[in-house]
Interface confidence: medium
């Protein structure tokens, strides 16, 4: 439309571009003056005024124009007098903008540049918190990091103060993010106070003081997994070889592993002496790809290494014929995970396995036949159930073996029976059954002097960190039609919160981007112990029937009328994705009351014996509990 304006906008933009290339907008030759009120750097969201005053020889401007980032502004411009105009912005939210103004002079067909200025908006710094200093073995540096708080958008500098508690001498280090301080410069003994001051054009804040002892903040040289091998014994055994160059004598390490398709990590702990390569044994399922990571800390000290890089190992297919059949039930159970129990060292008592396996084979054949008959004859299906109960071992339909009649299992079974009386509902969902129990041993010894939850550049552990109990039970709850999503539950006494973590995990320093584990997560977040993720709210499978779990609340101390009512009323729930770009483990959201009931805390621990996965029976005998009664 506007040929002249287009032409001269281009000329002015090019002129300014070349001017900036030679020293920025502040160095352009001005034929007047441009200024900003309240200031060139101001708090984001403020109303601001930009003034332009022309001082061009032989020119009384016809019009004054304002440009923001090269685009002409057309609104909120007021002519104050013959040579001055004002541009007003309400609620300015851009972190940076380049402003310039021009004049239309009668003797210049084109607009004449008056002047330009870079403006910035942002926030004053937050109080830096979670100040952490560590010494990576062999680095020769003390690395200090902190949580800077919300993004300021403007240039923010940090001054790290390091004060010796022995000599009272204080050193200051200026930085923009983190700081590496040479340990050679720390001549004032072993004890120091460290604090951080943050400052920018809009304000200044200071952190609390952190007291450190140089001997307590050393993180051992990185532990590395070098190789893995699987030995084909009666029970295949995988050996992971790993090592560290550390010279620290007492080192505690953790190795975590999981199937790549799984969400939950299993963790093994070791007190290690790195005078030789470490070998760790695992009894893993065949033909599955596993991932391993290891990390260490000086025993009894505060900080952990970051987890080592991911080490992948696929277990071979070659396993004894009989054993492999135990894993062929997936086709029967809508993809539900085969149950297994793993403990710290995964030792296994195989006595009775043969009988159990024979029973399983016989049962599998029967089940196949019954299923086929059941498809064609519904009346036969209901009639035969009572007879089958007489044939199969009681443990197949009552309890997880050696679980001493677990309340959780019983309650879920009873509830599944009640829920399924309405046969029209059966197609909509699968009753939840516990299909996997894992024990994870959390270190008993944890320092207690550092209570602050560590975020920022420090990695958040993705399993519970409080060692309030010697073990923590990991329970699987189904995401109905999509198989099982692993859950982590940490059963805390009343008043305990995960924010009071007793140990802190340090991350490999990759400032300023924070990451979780293998770097998938650009933001550090605490996820609830239970969280239900729905991949698409449009699919039928994503309707959640909380009624299935309401029965759990009817158990004395675990129940409250309000909670029960709310569960019964709210039969569906939609869940928001925190951010589409993040890869967060999918988890099922349960109220705390559910969690505390699910916790098998004081009961006898399940035995390690292999047992038949109950979920196979579930779809065929959903009224087993009722018939038994």
């Amino acid at each position: 439309m506007n040929q002249v304006t287009i032409q001269w906008d281009a000329v002015i933009a090019l002129y300014i571009l070349f001017s900036w290339c030679h020293g920025g907008i502040t160095n352009i030759n001005c034929s007047g003056h441009i200024w900003v009120e309240p200031a060139t750097i101001f708090k984001m969201g403020m109303n601001i005024s930009i003034y332009c005053q022309a001082a061009i020889k032989n020119c009384q401007p016809r019009k004054l124009h304002f440009y923001k980032n090269g685009i002409k502004e057309r609104f909120q411009i007021t002519r104050i007098n013959k040579t001055t105009a004002r541009l007003w912005y309400k609620n300015f939210l851009e972190p940076h903008a380049s402003m310039y103004c021009t004049a239309e002079c009668p003797k210049h067909f084109q607009e004449t540049l008056i002047c330009g200025k870079d403006i910035s908006s942002g926030y004053p710094p937050d109080i830096p918190d979670e100040v952490t200093c560590v010494i990576y073995e062999y680095s020769g540096n003390m690395t200090c990091t902190w949580n800077a708080g919300k993004l300021t958008y403007i240039d923010t500098k940090y001054v790290v103060h390091v004060k010796s508690l022995e000599t009272e001498e204080e050193q200051q280090y200026l930085t923009s993010s983190y700081i590496n301080i040479s340990t050679d410069s720390l001549q004032g003994g072993k004890k120091y106070l460290v604090w951080v001051q943050a400052a920018n054009a809009l304000g200044m804040e200071e952190s609390k003081q952190l007291q450190i002892h140089l001997d307590d903040i050393v993180i051992p040289s990185a532990a590395v997994i070098s190789r893995a091998e699987t030995i084909n014994a009666t029970v295949p055994k995988t050996i992971i070889y790993w090592d560290s160059q550390t010279t620290i004598e007492k080192v505690s390490c953790e190795m975590r592993y999981k199937a790549t398709t799984n969400q939950t990590w299993n963790v093994k702990e070791f007190d290690t002496n790195f005078t030789y390569v470490q070998q760790s044994e695992f009894y893993l399922e065949p033909n599955i790809k596993y991932v391993f990571q290891v990390r260490c800390q000086e025993t009894g000290k505060r900080y952990w290494q970051p987890w080592s890089s991911l080490f992948f190992h696929k277990t071979p297919e070659t396993v004894p014929q009989v054993t492999s059949k135990a894993f062929q039930h997936d086709t029967w159970n809508s993809g539900l995970t085969v149950a297994s129990i793993s403990t710290g060292h995964l030792t296994s008592d195989n006595r009775g396995d043969i009988g159990l396996l024979l029973g399983m084979i016989v049962f599998a054949v029967m089940l196949s036949i019954l299923s086929l008959i059941g498809i064609f004859n519904r009346s036969f299906r209901t009639g035969i159930k009572r007879r089958i109960l007489l044939l199969i071992p009681k443990w197949l339909y009552e309890d997880i073996p050696n679980m001493k009649n677990s309340n959780v299992v019983k309650m879920l079974q009873e509830n599944s029976e009640l829920m399924n009386n309405n046969s029209s509902e059966q197609v909509l969902y699968v009753d939840p059954m516990i299909t996997e129990i894992k024990e994870i041993f959390i270190p008993e010894h944890k320092p207690t002097d550092y209570k602050k939850e560590n975020t920022g550049p420090l990695e958040t552990r993705d399993y519970p960190q409080n060692s309030l109990f010697d073990n923590t039970t990991v329970v699987y709850i189904p995401d109905l039609n999509t198989g099982y999503k692993p859950q982590i539950s940490n059963f805390l006494p009343e008043g305990s919160h995960l924010s009071n973590n007793n140990e802190i995990t340090s991350l490999t320093l990759k400032p300023p981007v924070d990451s979780l584990d293998s770097g998938n997560n650009p933001r550090l977040q605490k996820h609830p112990n239970f969280a239900f993720s729905v991949s698409s709210v449009n699919s039928l499978s994503n309707t959640i029937f909380l009624g299935e779990l309401s029965l759990i609340l009817n158990q004395g101390e675990c129940s409250s009328p309000d909670i029960q009512n709310s569960v019964e009323e709210e039969t569906t729930m939609l869940l928001e994705n925190d951010s589409p770009s993040e890869t967060i483990p999918e988890q099922t959201l349960l109220p705390d009351e559910f969690v505390s009931c699910l916790g098998i805390v004081n009961e006898e621990l399940p035995s390690i014996n292999t047992y038949f996965p109950q979920n196979i029976l579930e779809s065929h005998f959903n009224r087993i509990s009722l018939l038994e009664k």
Epitope: N2, Q3, V4, T5, Q7, W8, V11, N58, Q60, R62, K63, P106, K107, H108, F109, Q110
Partner: antibody
Framework: EFQLQQFGPELLKPGASVKISCKAS????????MHWVKQSHGKSLEWIGG????????GYNGKFKDKATLTVDKSSSTAYMELRSLTSEDSAVYYC???????????WGQGTTLTVSS | DIKMTQSPSSMYASLGERVTITCKAS??????LSWCQQKPGKSPKALIY???SLVDGVPSRFSGSGSGQDYSLTISSLEYEDMGIYYC?????????FGGGTKLEMK
């Protein structure tokens, strides 16, 4: 006395080109922008474009961008408008006009009548 | 482009009569409007600039008013030499645009 002197009329064939002149006198030629305006027979006025003699800056109405080219000769204080690929639609009176410091066309040339006919 | 709508397109008036011609812009033109007069066979001549300022040498019976989008030219007492065509011109934005003209004739 201020004066903008135009010459003509012109009679041309379709497809030809023509360069219309406008000679300024009585003022400093480089101090004022020179504009060109078209008036078809019995019609209103249309702004074609303008040129700054001192700075060489030009601006065109998009409608005439491919039709007209504006130039100046400072030594003779003359502004020129070249019209190319003439058609009967280009038959009109063409005026040059000075845009003064108070931002209006204070002086106009007497106009050049252009007739395009085969 | 900014469109200038002028009205009426023609009118008849008597000597000594008060005459008003109006011009409406398609958008706010910030009073960057001038009025000019053209007599048959002659070049246009400026009367008013910046909506209400009288050009030197123009009789005081001519006056301009208006702001934003609406402007008017008034001849307080029509005289014989005022016959001709009147045009409004906006010069707020390129391309400059003229109104369609108002032909003023004697009754």
């Amino acid at each position: 006395e201020f004066q903008l002197q135009q010459f003509g009329p012109e009679l041309l064939k379709p497809g030809a080109s023509v360069k219309i002149s406008c000679k300024a006198s009585g003022y400093t030629f480089t101090d004022y922008i020179m504009h060109w305006v078209k008036q078809s027979h019995g019609k209103s006025l249309e702004w074609i474009g303008g040129i700054s003699p001192n700075y060489g800056g030009t601006g065109y109405n998009g409608k005439f961008k491919d039709k007209a080219t504006l130039t100046v000769d400072k030594s003779s204080s003359t502004a020129y408008m070249e019209l190319r690929s003439l058609t009967s639609e280009d038959s009109a009176v063409y005026y040059c006009a000075r845009f003064n410091n108070y931002y209006y066309f204070d002086y106009w040339g007497q106009g050049t009548t252009l007739t395009v006919s085969s | 482009d900014i469109k200038m709508t002028q009205s009426p397109s023609s009118m008849y008036a008597s000597l000594g009569e008060r005459v008003t011609i109006t011009c409406k812009a398609s958008q706010d033109i910030n009073s960057y409007l001038s009025w000019c007069q053209q007599k048959p066979g002659k070049s246009p001549k400026a009367l008013i600039y910046r909506a209400n300022s009288l050009v030197d040498g123009v009789p005081s019976r001519f006056s301009g008013s208006g702001s934003g989008q609406d402007y008017s030219l008034t001849i307080s007492s029509l005289e014989y030499e005022d016959m001709g065509i009147y045009y409004c011109l906006q010069y707020d934005e390129f391309p400059y645009t003229f109104g369609g003209g108002t032909k003023l004739e004697m009754k």
